[in-house]
């Protein structure tokens, strides 16, 4: 059974041209994490994997920076990274773990950070 | 320029262990890890598992955990992978391979050790 | 694990042909997807990584694609050099697993 609970920074802003922290944190498991997987819709970005370390795709490689921890560093951000973006934790024995987190790119240098959230 | 040269073959009986090296030159440890993959006669690639030199961490394919151990030795570079409870069904080449940098596809392999298993 | 299933398992070209070789994964990998070129009695050589990225010194013939669970190695102008084995591989989670390879032969 599945009991674990995944914790992201929910909906968040950033400003053009800055950089934001992706964070999720699995809890009220026991489960080992094997590895995490962050996603943005269609495409993978990179990939933390507890004992190998980390891979980031060549698509990203300019723009993304591994960590803090099992988070990812997104930089020089635009518009165009608007959008959801998912953390899937691998564990053992529970299995799979998926967390969401909504990214919006503003213009303005108004970018307020949203309340966290839970998804079971 | 990136070398990873491997130790000679070997013929084992059946319930012994072998235990293959890999010297790496030519590039540092830092943000690659170390992986071993086997080939039996006539066969297809197999991933026994890969060793984080940095972290020291190593993930195994549970085919293998707990007969294969991936080790390595930072002081000299050489990686190690060593398979116990041998059965003549081990019987293949074992290539030593590294991830490129950041990425989890192997971009240089050492030359294959073939390891013969038989009574 | 995942499973990585190739096909053909064999072919027979000419120089010269377009030689397309396709790896369904047995679930969503995104792009976790390499390619290797194995010559008999050789170690594998990288050729494609991340589905679609050409490995440094590997000629312009040689492309990837594909996302999902779908991928193909396309050769546009097979050369003599090329007769080898071909193998996909899937690094999206562990173990990381191999296709059972394509071997392309000289018609």
């Known amino acids: 059974m599945m009991t674990g609970t995944i914790e992201t920074t929910g909906n968040i802003s950033a400003e053009k041209g800055g950089s934001i922290i992706l964070q999720c944190h699995l809890s009220s498991t026991t489960a080992q994490v094997t590895q995490v997987n962050w996603e943005q819709q269609d495409q993978l970005l990179a990939i933390c994997n507890a004992d190998l370390g980390w891979h980031i795709s060549p698509s990203f490689k300019d723009r993304v920076a591994p960590g803090p921890g099992l988070g990812l560093t997104l930089q020089s951000l635009t518009v165009n990274d608007t959008g959801e973006y998912f953390c899937i934790y691998h564990t053992y024995p529970d299995g799979t773990y998926t967390g969401r987190i909504f990214l919006e790119v503003l213009e303005s240098s108004v970018a307020e950070h949203g309340a966290r959230f839970q998804i079971p | 320029q990136v070398q990873l040269v491997q130790s000679g073959a070997e013929v084992k009986k059946p319930g012994a262990s072998v235990k293959v090296s890999c010297k790496a030159s030519?590039?540092?440890?830092?943000?690659?890890?170390m992986h071993w993959v086997r080939q039996a006669p006539g066969q297809g690639l197999e991933w026994i598992g890969g060793f984080n030199p940095n972290s020291g961490g190593s993930s195994y394919n549970q085919k293998f955990k707990g007969r294969a151990t991936l080790t390595v030795d930072k002081s000299i570079s050489t990686a190690y992978m060593e398979l116990s409870r041998l059965r003549s069904d081990d019987t293949a080449v074992y290539y030593c391979?590294?991830?490129?940098?950041?990425?989890?596809?192997?971009?240089?392999w050492g030359q294959g050790t073939t390891v013969t298993v038989s009574s | 694990d995942i499973q990585m299933t190739q096909s053909p398992s064999s072919l027979s070209a000419s120089v010269g042909d377009r030689v397309t070789i396709t790896c369904k994964a047995s679930q969503d990998v995104k792009t976790a997807v390499a390619w290797y070129q194995q010559k008999p009695g050789k170690a594998p050589k990288l050729l494609i990584y991340?589905?679609?990225f050409r490995y440094t010194g590997v000629p312009s013939r040689f492309s990837g694609s594909g996302s999902g669970a779908d991928f193909t190695l396309t050769i546009s102008s097979l050369q003599p050099e090329d007769f080898a084995t071909y193998y996909c591989q899937q690094h999206y989670t562990t173990p990381w697993t191999f296709g059972q390879g394509t071997k392309v032969e000289i018609k």
């Open positions: 030519g590039f540092t440890f830092t943000g690659r890890s």
């Open positions: 391979a590294r991830s490129s940098y950041y990425r989890f596809d192997l971009d240089y």
């Open positions: 991340s589905a679609s």
